[in-house]
């Protein structure tokens, strides 16, 4: 996160760290807890690393440097990448992770509410992006979970800034015209959440941007509301019954 500040314990209890253990262990992506056994993240996090057993998912943590060999983590039972995601395109950047064992909810580890299907009418004015990603383009992974308040921008405005790419209705953009605040490398897959009527909702999944926090280059996020049918279909067909956090 560029231009962010340290988060507090329990402030973003749905935020998880997706880490890979090969020879060493490192944080690669963020994700959002959406049910006892489900994490929502970006499909591109798994490019070149589709093997379930190399991944470790840490929930209920604030500081990555607190992780030791004894810190509990979740393992992956199943990775469900959107069927229309292609490595050569930037569309449908969404994936579900089914955990091997369900997680208990605590003050520091609980799910984020999902938006309503095709939610286009809600005007979100209080949106935040969180993650342990770089604090500048040529930076490094941060120890303490960072947060930053970023306004949504219209898809029309976003398309003007990215003439070279297709900004679809299944994407949502956020950023300041002058730059300075944005997600960055390592924040992929993490949440863009907005508070509406006193409730936090998962509006976007951190997907891509041109550099980080550059002027007139907003961040682009997968629009979760556009994938609600897919999320419900996959979680229900796998579970029998879904235990998702839908909006009240």
């Amino acid at each position: 996160i560029v231009g962010g500040t340290n988060s507090s314990w329990g402030e973003w209890p749905w935020q998880v760290s997706l880490q890979v253990k090969l020879t060493a262990q490192r944080h690669l992506c963020g994700g959002s807890l959406i049910g006892h056994q489900w994490v929502l993240t970006a499909a591109h996090c798994f490019d070149g690393l589709p093997l379930q057993d190399v991944w470790r998912i840490y929930s209920g943590i604030l500081n990555l440097s607190d992780i030791t060999k004894d810190t509990p983590f979740s393992q992956i039972k199943e990775i469900i990448i959107h069927q229309n995601y292609k490595v050569s395109e930037g569309n449908h950047d969404i994936a579900l992770i089914k955990l091997q064992a369900p997680l208990n909810y605590t003050e520091f580890q609980k799910p984020i509410c999902l938006p309503s299907k095709g939610d286009t009418s809600t005007i979100y004015t209080n949106c935040w992006v969180t993650g342990w990603g770089f604090s500048k383009e040529k930076g490094e992974i941060q120890n303490i979970l960072q947060k930053v308040n970023i306004p949504l921008v219209t898809n029309e405005e976003c398309q003007k800034r990215y003439q070279d790419y297709k900004i679809t209705q299944r994407m949502v953009c956020a950023g300041y015209k002058e730059g300075g605040k944005d997600a960055c490398k390592g924040d992929s897959g993490g949440p863009l959440v907005c508070k509406h009527n006193g409730m936090w909702r998962l509006v976007g999944i951190t997907s891509w941007g041109e550099g980080c926090a550059r002027r007139e280059q907003p961040g682009v996020y997968t629009k979760v509301a556009e994938y609600m049918d897919w999320i419900l279909e996959k979680t229900q067909s796998s579970d029998g019954k879904a235990q998702m956090q839908s909006p009240a």
Epitope: V87, G90, D164, K166, A183, S207, G209
Partner: antibody, heavy 125, light 108 residues
Framework: EVQLLESGGGLVQPGGSLRLSCAAS????????MQWVRQAPGKGLQWVSY????????GYADSVKGRFTISRDNSKNTLYLQMNSLRAEDTAVYYC??????????????????WGQGTLVTVSS | DIQMTQSPGTLSLSPGERATLSCRTS???????LAWYQQTPGQAPRLLIY???SRATGIPDRFSGTGYGTDFTLTISRLEPEDYGTYYC?????????FGQGTRVEIK
Amino acid sequence: EVQLLESGGGLVQPGGSLRLSCAASGFTFSNYTMQWVRQAPGKGLQWVSYISPSGGYTGYADSVKGRFTISRDNSKNTLYLQMNSLRAEDTAVYYCARVARGIAARSRTSYFDYWGQGTLVTVSS
Amino acid sequence: DIQMTQSPGTLSLSPGERATLSCRTSQFVNSNYLAWYQQTPGQAPRLLIYGASSRATGIPDRFSGTGYGTDFTLTISRLEPEDYGTYYCQQSSRTPWTFGQGTRVEIK
């Protein structure tokens, strides 16, 4: 299976014009940036031009700017290169290629993942 | 323009040997926009490596790419007969997109 098939090459006199076409199949053409790359006989690869998925955004090498025009017809899955005021130094095999633009580490990637077999353009009197 | 300089110009090696090809850029290039291609005589180029280090679909694991910033390397761990040809690095970080002049790998 992704396929790109160029056509329209041939022998043309200096100052003349030629229009190259590239028929695409096996993928959603309208989702991809497309481009032309050329290779003079016995020489290396030189990027010529590209066009965004909608056709609203283009780029050209300085050596062809003002003389060549790239365009596309997404309804026909076809890419074009209109070449005017041709010079001897434009003699080359012209390849059309798909520009893959995925995502890695929260940034876009860009690389040329599929190429046609090329069409030879010879500019000579 | 970003200049791409490849070295050596020609590499003469026997099958089974290791090939190390270098590509230097005149300006910083984001690794996501650095690719390597192989071309054999009479054929179109073929994508080998994208994002500086990711192997394209169907490319054997004897091919690997590394590098960051202005220095990139393509390594072929054990040369096979079909690996002989010309290799190009290429950047699409900034237009004009540019290629290196190529490194020819020939049979010793």
